[in-house]
């Protein structure tokens, strides 16, 4: 084994190095000392380190470690943050387009419904946006509310245009009749299925991206233990105490120390791998009724079909509703 | 992807959104993200090595520091912890992760469970025996002559048509919504049961 080079007789080199870490403080001995109070850089002979220096080295080592960790995750963190923002904005744009497509359909095909239809369509798509962002709304309720609101307007404006301005009484009866008589056939059910599946997947996709950011942030800002600080100090700075300024740690030794310091963080690995693979599976399945873009941008056409279905069955419906809501109607005219 | 009837969206701006095929779409962007994320799949297991390679370690030098003394880079002592008695590296590992790390692991477990549930083959959760549209083949109302049809021959084309980033700032207002000059569903000449509904019957009148 080669003999260690003789330590700097005056600790001058060590002082100039240490001054960079802690300018102005006179913690470096003028000449090598026994160092019996040292706890980390235990000397085999005289040393140029003091207890205070050792503490400063530990602090610096932990800070270095935190910075290294942050720079290690910078690219990954940026990737997820940027994509989470981009997808959230894109989903909002899809919702906005879907709303405008639906409004355009009403404006072009059912102008007599438009003022109220715009309002109900607006409320529906607001709920869609809120749901994607994590709001505790039931999708089936959203769809039911849309059709419950639309039917009285369709009935009074399209099916029975001669009726006086509808009053609350008949509207409530019509809302009830809408479900009891399956006025829109199976269209609401189709929309519920498609919207709930596509929005569920979209919501989980965004949740997963946001959790990804949280994972990186958590490991990014980890505070390393005192034990780790001591190991890092010994690896990075104890050589200075012997005046070995240009010597670097051995690679294998560094790996052992890092694995020790990061034992907790590395435990995330298994779940992180699973996270990426599960996210990939989800993304691979995001098509057809699991793709909110496909579903929401096609919603106007399904709503259009549902209104046509009502119109085709208008005869039967008008008779049945006439009997069902006659009481409300009489009260309205009284 | 969703079907956009030309006769409803005659505004050229909208057609641009509706019919772009080769530009970046949401689904292509999602796949691109996954490919990039997959390059980070070993991020946590590779961290110790990454940090060592980004902090000063002896690469070309003959001698290196093992925590206690200068040694030859390829000697057995190079990898060994020079101060075994100071504190035990094994103990440090045995302590287990910090509470914040345990917490984040629990959250990862939870989201992984959700992701798996959502992407089980055939979709997923309780959708066994469902056709591609998400309905059972015989999903007919008891008192209705109705069923939801299967996907059929290319019923929904799998092609996202929203221009992704290029259109991110583009907002289509209802006022822009085309169709003032052309009906989406022009009525047949005179054939409309509703034209005459007033005369047909209305039990509520």
């Amino acid at each position: 084994q080669p003999p260690p080079p003789p330590p700097d007789a005056t600790c001058h080199q060590v002082r100039s190095f240490f001054q960079r870490l802690q300018p102005g403080l006179k913690w470096v001995p003028e000449t090598p000392v026994p160092g019996s109070d040292l706890q980390v850089c235990l000397p085999k002979g005289p040393t140029c380190c003091s207890r205070k220096m050792e503490e400063k080295y530990q602090l610096t080592a932990r800070l270095n470690m935190e910075q290294l960790l942050q720079s290690a995750s910078m690219e990954l963190k940026f990737l997820i943050i940027q994509n989470a923002a981009v997808f959230q904005e894109a989903f909002e744009i899809v919702v906005r387009h879907a709303k405008n497509y639906t409004n355009a359909m009403f404006k072009n095909n059912y102008p007599s419904l438009t003022p109220q239809a715009f309002e109900f369509v607006g409320e529906f798509f607001t709920d869609v946006s809120l749901y994607i962002l994590g709001s505790d709304i039931n999708v089936d309720d959203m769809v039911n509310e849309l059709f419950d609101s639309l039917f009285p307007v369709i009935y009074t404006q399209l099916m029975n245009p001669g009726l006086p301005d509808s009053a609350l009484d008949i509207n409530e009866c019509l809302r009830g009749a809408r479900r009891d008589l399956k006025v829109f056939g199976n269209f609401p059910k189709l929309i519920m299925t498609q919207v709930s599946k596509s929005l569920q997947v979209t919501r989980i996709f965004l949740q997963a991206l946001n959790l990804g950011i949280e994972v990186i942030n958590t490991t990014d800002h980890l505070k390393f233990s005192k034990d780790c600080g001591r190991m890092l100090t010994r690896m990075w700075y104890c050589s200075y105490c012997q005046g070995l300024m240009m010597v670097k740690p051995c690679g294998g030794y560094c790996n052992v120390v890092m694995q020790g310091c990061m034992a907790g963080v590395v435990e995330i690995d298994k779940y992180w791998r699973e996270y990426i693979l599960s996210l990939e599976e989800l993304v691979n399945g995001m098509y057809r009724i699991y793709d909110m873009e496909n579903v929401l941008l096609g919603l106007f056409s399904t709503i259009h079909d549902s209104i046509q279905y009502v119109q085709k069955n208008a005869g039967k419906l008008t008779t049945t509703i006439g009997k069902l809501c006659a009481h409300s109607q009489q009260r309205q005219y009284r | 992807s969703a079907y956009y009837p030309e006769d409803l969206f005659i505004d050229k701006k909208v057609l641009k959104v509706a019919h772009v095929e080769h530009e970046e779409t949401l689904s292509s962007r999602r796949r691109e993200l996954i490919q990039k994320l997959k390059s980070f799949i070993s991020f946590y297991s590779a961290l110790p090595g990454y940090i060592c390679s980004h902090s000063p370690v002896a690469e070309n030098d003959t001698l290196c520091w093992n925590g206690q003394e200068l040694v030859e880079r390829y000697s057995q002592k190079a990898a060994r912890n020079g101060m075994k008695n100071q504190f035990n590296l094994h103990e440090l590992k045995m302590k287990g992760p910090e509470p914040v790390v345990s917490q984040i692991i629990d959250k990862l477990k939870h989201i992984n469970q959700l992701l798996r549930t959502m992407s089980m083959p055939k979709g997923r959760v309780l959708d066994k025996n469902l056709d591609e549209e998400g309905f059972e083949a015989g999903d007919c109302g008891d008192d209705e002559d109705e069923c939801i049809g299967g996907a059929g021959d290319g019923m929904i084309k799998v092609k996202n048509q929203l221009r992704f980033l290029a259109e991110l700032a583009y907002d289509l207002d209802v006022d822009d919504a085309p169709g003032n000059s052309q009906q989406a569903t022009p009525k047949d000449n005179e054939i409309s049961t509703f034209h005459n509904l007033g005369n047909v019957h209305s039990p509520l009148k």
Epitope: T302, N313 | G149, G150, S192, N196, V200
Partner: antibody
Framework: QVQLQQSGAELARPGASVKLSCRAS????????ISWMMQRTGQGLEWIGE????????YYNEKFKGKATLTADKSSSTAYMQLSSLTSEDSAVYFC????????????WGQGTLVTVSA | DIQMTQSPASLSASVGETVTITCRTS??????LAWYQQKQGKSPQLLVY???TLPEGVPSRFSGSGSGTQFSLKINSLQPEDFGSYYC?????????FGGGTKLEIK
């Protein structure tokens, strides 16, 4: 002008399936429902069911559930009807017809497809 | 389902005559009734809807009447091209049903 072009005559064995097509032109395919009718030789018309090409939702006459399956391909503006487990009872002319947007009225019809089921 | 009963099942008439075909429904369908004409080997053609409305292009010698459960189709001054089969159909709701048909032959 509105046209519905149906596929040619089919000869099938009992137990087999056939798939009839109805190609629409002259209007926006997704704006109207397509209905299918059956007419046995020298008899009246029976409504089998209809499909809304936009959403793919179908409505069937109770009598034809399990016998007929309606689908539509928007890209080719074509509606299809598959008849399964054929028996001699299914020998008939099958028509597709386009309705109006607000009623079960059929102003436009295909020319009909003769299906003959014979061993 | 609503049952449609047409009568007569067949009738013979000469060119220039007036004929009436009737259709009875099993329940009140108000005015939601259509009539179709079908010639041998051809597809049906819509003649009347909403019980009495003629689509564009249908000659005025055809007229429909009735409401509720009783309906009729009247053809004034029969022309050679009027011979064939006639079907009534309700468009009151799902499922639409057709009558058994009336075969109109040249005497």
């Amino acid at each position: 002008q509105v046209q519905l072009q149906q596929s040619g005559a089919e000869l099938a064995r009992p137990g087999a399936s056939v798939k009839l097509s109805c190609r629409a032109s002259g209007y926006t395919f997704t704006s109207y429902g397509i209905s299918w009718m059956m007419q046995r030789t020298g008899q009246g018309l029976e409504w089998i069911g209809e499909i809304y090409p936009r959403s793919g939702i179908t409505y069937y006459n109770e009598k034809f559930k399990g016998k007929a399956t309606l689908t539509a391909d928007k890209s080719s503006s074509t509606a299809y009807m598959q008849l399964s487990s054929l028996t001699s009872e299914d020998s008939a002319v099958y028509f597709c017809a386009r309705d109006v947007s607000d009623g079960y009225l059929f102003p436009y019809w295909g020319q009909g497809t003769l299906v003959t089921v014979s061993a | 389902d609503i049952q449609m009963t047409q009568s007569p099942a067949s009738l013979s008439a000469s060119v220039g005559e007036t004929v009436t075909i009737t259709c009875r429904t099993s329940e009140n369908i108000y005015s939601y009734l259509a009539w179709y004409q079908q010639k041998q080997g051809k597809s049906p053609q819509l003649l009347v809807y909403n019980a009495k409305t003629l689509p564009e292009g249908v000659p005025s010698r055809f007229s429909g009447s009735g409401s509720g459960t009783q309906f009729s189709l009247k053809i004034n001054s029969l022309q050679p091209e009027d011979f064939g089969s006639y079907y009534c159909q309700h468009h009151y709701g799902t499922p639409p049903t057709f009558g058994g048909g009336t075969k109109l032959e040249i005497k």
